[in-house]
């Protein structure tokens, strides 16, 4: 058929240090060379349909497919992945390409499937199918590690069913908060599937393997602590386990505890309860609230109640699949050039995240931290004052998020010049974005006081580097001006910048710096 | 739904008294422990008391001897008893059942 455009479509891997933008760009990251994926016509389709040669990728690993369409004149498009619809920005090549790019950050499960891009050009409208799927996904994975009670024991067997076999530790702590940090004295590390001290103040199971480090920490609400002023809140999956430990200490043992899931107490089988005595002989009990396989109606309020302590509650939710809950608008900042300043992103998600801070094709270490009120939030101030768009990325089992920062440094313009034989271009990144002023040195005016207006084009915000915006002004040239040198001039809030620039007949072009 | 009223507060000088009450609907009160809570200008929020559904009560060490807290079931109502006023008790008084909260009253001491 001479109606259709010729199409070659691409998939390009990205190196590991590499990262994106998130679900979709149009200015994918330049990496490995890219890889024909064929895209031949599929036969007995209804429609134009293209189908590209399967794509199938490691766990983790950045990619972009891409598309090329040789077609006169404009197109618009439009991405479909699991009947959700996904922005499309078409850009042009060099070779006046039309050029489409899906860029898929750290590959995982949820990603894998079929990538629809309807494309409409101004000839025809056309399908290319992509299919992706994750490359040996039985072969590797790590689980967060779950409790369960030892048979017959007052212990607890920490699990994760994870290929390879992960090496499981538990992670000990009797001290409070910062000083339970990971590398803390205070912490102790038990390279064991099974716990039998179950007193103390933080316990932690870990399992790690060739994919990482996962975690679970064992709830606990402690009645010797002040009631927080936020409620406790714990997330679990339908079919997940529940365990949640009750702790008090007093100076004898004339006291018990008791759970109650909403002010019902519960059944036998339900729960269990260890005692012992401190050192400085005050008796310390603990009584566990576990649920092997949680469904709906496990939904509620947990009180543990004491006759010698005040009782405290925890709602625990029980959700059929993880979220992560945040706001996903996009932030502008505009900060000084030596103000200190970082970004910060607030949210609430189970199972915990994977998350990466991305700037100018760079993916940066992304911390989380733990707030009271069961958000979490993390911050990222490694920006070191470069002006552009910043991306925070994360995901769990279930959901993903992307959230874009735009970081705009305050200061006076610096300009650029270049000249051909017809025109003069200055261009400037100052913030807040310039304004401009051309001004022609003469015998009449040698300070260059004389304006010029005509023939003068202010371009602002032309070209958008990872979020930078640059400003240009042309001025074309005519007779009036030839051989005179003129003077561009970018001002803003915090100064002025010139070039000037001498406008002789075709050939090398002298600048002059001028601040 | 449920909702929680504080009510009694206001200004009283040093040394005197006050009673709160906290009453309670949409919520079957006797079977909740209920707590108080007071946040003074510019400090967090922290807690001052609780009553238990079977009447035990629990009090922070600030105000452990000065202030009683008690329940009238049938009234579905809580109640903070406040002797030997300080100025620093100065605070919005908030009382809690779960994760529901009152508006809160305002108790000035002035010295």
């Known amino acids: 058929n001479q109606d259709l455009p010729v199409i070659k479509c691409v998939l390009i891997n990205h190196k590991n240090n590499d990262s994106s933008v998130g679900k979709s760009s149009s200015y994918p990251m330049v990496s490995e060379s890219p890889e024909d994926l064929g895209c031949a016509l599929r036969p007995q389709s209804s429609g134009t349909v293209y189908e590209a040669a399967a794509v199938e990728v490691d766990v983790s690993a950045s990619i972009t497919l891409q598309v090329l369409v040789d077609a006169p004149g404009n197109i618009s498009c439009l991405w479909v992945f699991k009947h959700s619809s996904l922005n499309c920005q078409p850009h042009f090549d060099l070779q006046n390409r039309g050029v489409v790019s899906m860029v898929i950050l750290k590959m995982t499960e949820t990603q894998a499937g079929e990538y629809l891009l309807f494309i409409q050009s101004e000839a025809t409208n056309y399908t290319i199918l992509f299919t992706v799927s994750i490359r040996n996904t039985l072969l590797y994975t790590l689980r967060r590690p779950y409790f369960r009670k030892m048979e017959n024991q007052d212990a607890l067997v920490c699990i994760s069913e994870s290929v390879p076999e992960p090496i499981v530790e538990w992670v000990l702590c009797d001290s409070q908060g910062e000083s339970c940090k990971e590398e803390s004295p205070a912490v102790v590390k038990k390279e064991e599937k099974v716990l039998h001290e179950l007193f103390g103040t933080d316990i932690r199971c870990c399992a790690r393997n060739e994919l990482g480090r996962e975690c679970t920490r064992l709830f606990t609400i402690d009645l010797n602590q002040t009631p927080q002023t936020t409620l406790p809140q714990l997330f679990l999956k339908v079919g997940e386990p529940l365990w949640i430990r009750c702790k008090a200490v007093h100076v004898n043992h004339g006291f018990g505890l008791t759970w109650e899931l909403e002010n019902k107490a519960l059944e036998e089988g339900n729960y269990f309860e260890m005692s012992t005595y401190s050192t400085n002989r005050t008796m310390i009990r603990i009584l566990f609230a576990f649920v092997s396989s949680v469904a709906r109606n496990d939904t509620g309020y947990y009180t543990c109640s004491s006759s010698k302590h005040p009782s405290q509650s925890a709602l625990v939710t029980i959700v059929e699949k993880g979220f992560i809950n945040a706001t996903n608008s996009s932030e502008d900042y505009e900060i000084d050039q030596y103000e200190e300043f970082c970004f910060s992103v607030r949210f609430k998600a189970y199972p915990q995240i994977r998350c990466t801070w991305t700037f100018s094709r760079k993916s940066f270490p992304c911390e989380q931290k733990g707030l009271d009120n069961g958000y979490s939030i993390s911050k990222f101030c490694n920006h070191k004052h470069q002006p552009g768009e910043y991306i925070f990325h994360a995901e769990n089992d279930d959901a993903q998020f992307t959230k874009m920062f735009t970081l705009n440094i305050r200061r006076k313009p610096q300009v650029l010049a270049e000249a051909s034989a017809s025109q003069a271009s200055c261009f400037s990144d100052g913030y807040p974005l310039p304004s401009w002023t051309w001004k022609k040195c003469s015998d009449k005016s040698p300070n260059c006081t004389e304006e010029i207006t005509e023939g003068v084009w202010n371009r602002k915000a032309n070209r958008k580097v990872f979020g930078q915006w640059v400003s240009s002004s042309t001025l074309n040239m005519s007779e009036a001006i030839k051989g005179f040198l003129v003077k561009c001039c970018a001002y803003n809030s915090l100064g002025t910048s010139c070039e000037t620039i001498l406008l002789n007949s075709p050939g090398p072009f002298p600048f002059i710096q001028d601040n | 739904q449920v909702q929680l009223q504080e009510s009694g507060g206001g200004l009283v000088q040093a040394g005197g008294s006050l009673r709160l009450s906290c009453a309670a609907s949409g919520v079957t009160f006797s079977i909740n422990y209920i707590d108080w809570y007071r946040q003074a200008p510019g400090k967090q929020r922290e807690w001052v008391a609780q009553?238990?559904?079977?009447?035990?009560?629990f009090y922070a060490d600030s105000v452990k001897g000065r202030f009683a807290i008690s329940r009238d079931n049938a009234k579905n109502t809580v109640y903070l008893q406040m002797n030997s006023l300080k100025p620093e008790d100065t605070a919005v008084y908030y009382c809690?059942?779960?994760?529901?909260w009152g508006q809160g009253t305002q108790v000035t001491v002035s010295s």
């Open positions: 809690r059942v779960l994760s529901y």
């Open positions: 009553i238990t559904r079977d009447s035990n009560s």
